[in-house]
Amino acid sequence: LIIGFGISGRHSITVTTVASAGNIGEDGILSCTFEPDIKLSDIVIQWLKEGVLGLVHEFKEGKDELSEQDEMFRGRTAVFADQVIVGNASLRLKNVQLTDAGTYKCYIITSKGKGNANLEYKTGAFSMPEVNVDYNASSETLRCEAPRWFPQPTVVWASQVDQGANFSEVSNTSFELNSENVTMKVVSVLYNVTINNTYSCMIENDIAKATGDIKVTESEIKRRSHLQLLNSKAS
């Protein structure tokens, strides 16, 4: 969390941003909030990016003002217009690109004063893994697949019964480049698995950590997966 204050002028307002990550090819949110002001006509929101000449986005007098917008963001940005009045200056970024990563500034003017805060935005690819029993294998084998990751992640297997065990000798992980030549499909195979045990396939890079669990018993198979972004720090 980054909290910024206005530095010049008589009044300053608090502006708060949260560092976040964008999943390339999908829509992302650059989070920014400020002290609410009911007078919409006085609110100005400017999003700027370090190293970019034009604006990322500008909202003033109750509407988007995009005459100064940089070409790389053309047609890809929007604020939540109905939420501005309650202090939400967050930016929706469509079709996140790898090159969208960097330092952004959320700059706010209201009838109460001015303020700004910076935001670190990381970009990459992350997806939920799915763990299945590989019935085609000669021995009891689990197959963990996740369709899109970038940068290349690490894959670690764990088991509830054998806590702390190192499965690197009995697993094999491969990375297959996807058609857009950036993201990769992750496939990891775990051999010699035992029944009545819960196994976890953990995929992690510097942006996200995802886990796929599978519990195999004689009567049923239970699966669960979750994904966590690693750099959600507010400022």
Epitope: P36, L40, G62, A81, Q83, V84, I85, V86, G87
Partner: antibody, heavy 117, light 107 residues
Framework: QLQLQESGPGLVKPSETLSLTCTVS??????????WSWIRQPPGKGLEWIGS???????YYNPSLKSRVTISVDTSKNQFSLKLSSVTAADTAVYYC?????????WGQGTMVIVSS | DIQMTQSPSSLSASVGDRVTITCRAS??????LNWYQQKPGKAPKLLIY???SLQSGVPSRFSGSGSGTDFTLTISSLQPEDFATYYC?????????FGGGTKVEIK
Amino acid sequence: QLQLQESGPGLVKPSETLSLTCTVSGGSISSSVYYWSWIRQPPGKGLEWIGSILVSGSTYYNPSLKSRVTISVDTSKNQFSLKLSSVTAADTAVYYCARAVSFLDVWGQGTMVIVSS
Amino acid sequence: DIQMTQSPSSLSASVGDRVTITCRASQSISSYLNWYQQKPGKAPKLLIYGASSLQSGVPSRFSGSGSGTDFTLTISSLQPEDFATYYCQQSYDPPWTFGGGTKVEIK
């Protein structure tokens, strides 16, 4: 779902202070940023915004009523209140409380207040 | 204050009719225009916000358009339950102000 309920006396004497409370149920008044608002409607007439409050305590009043209005919030009771001083017969109306972002999306049922001696 | 002028103040229509109500602001309010429906003895109900966004649960026969100073509420095919009074409201600048209302009556 979220519900708002106005309460207070239905009859107020001229020159006295009108006091109403809005109780929020089905959700916390401080769970998100909203303008907790008061609107009134004289019999057979249109709607008039009285004012709004944020849980931070920031208040916004209609300039036509500003000198007579106080809106306050009590997060511990999940309530916000309206006080309108020095009332006259012109303040006779149905008083509504409502939740707003840039639109008033949840309203109380309204309470009729008559100013009469 | 921003004045909101609604027209007509009343209209008579039949079930199935297409009904249009207009609202004009005394200055530009961007798209910060909301529409409400009120039935006798009841609180207003939000229909349209941000000039054209349909509030959740509101039938799709209701639609809104416009920006700046001129706005329209359209009911594509009037239903028996639509006979009510309709108000526009701006939230661009305080004080928030409402139009005078349009009463839709049965012909």
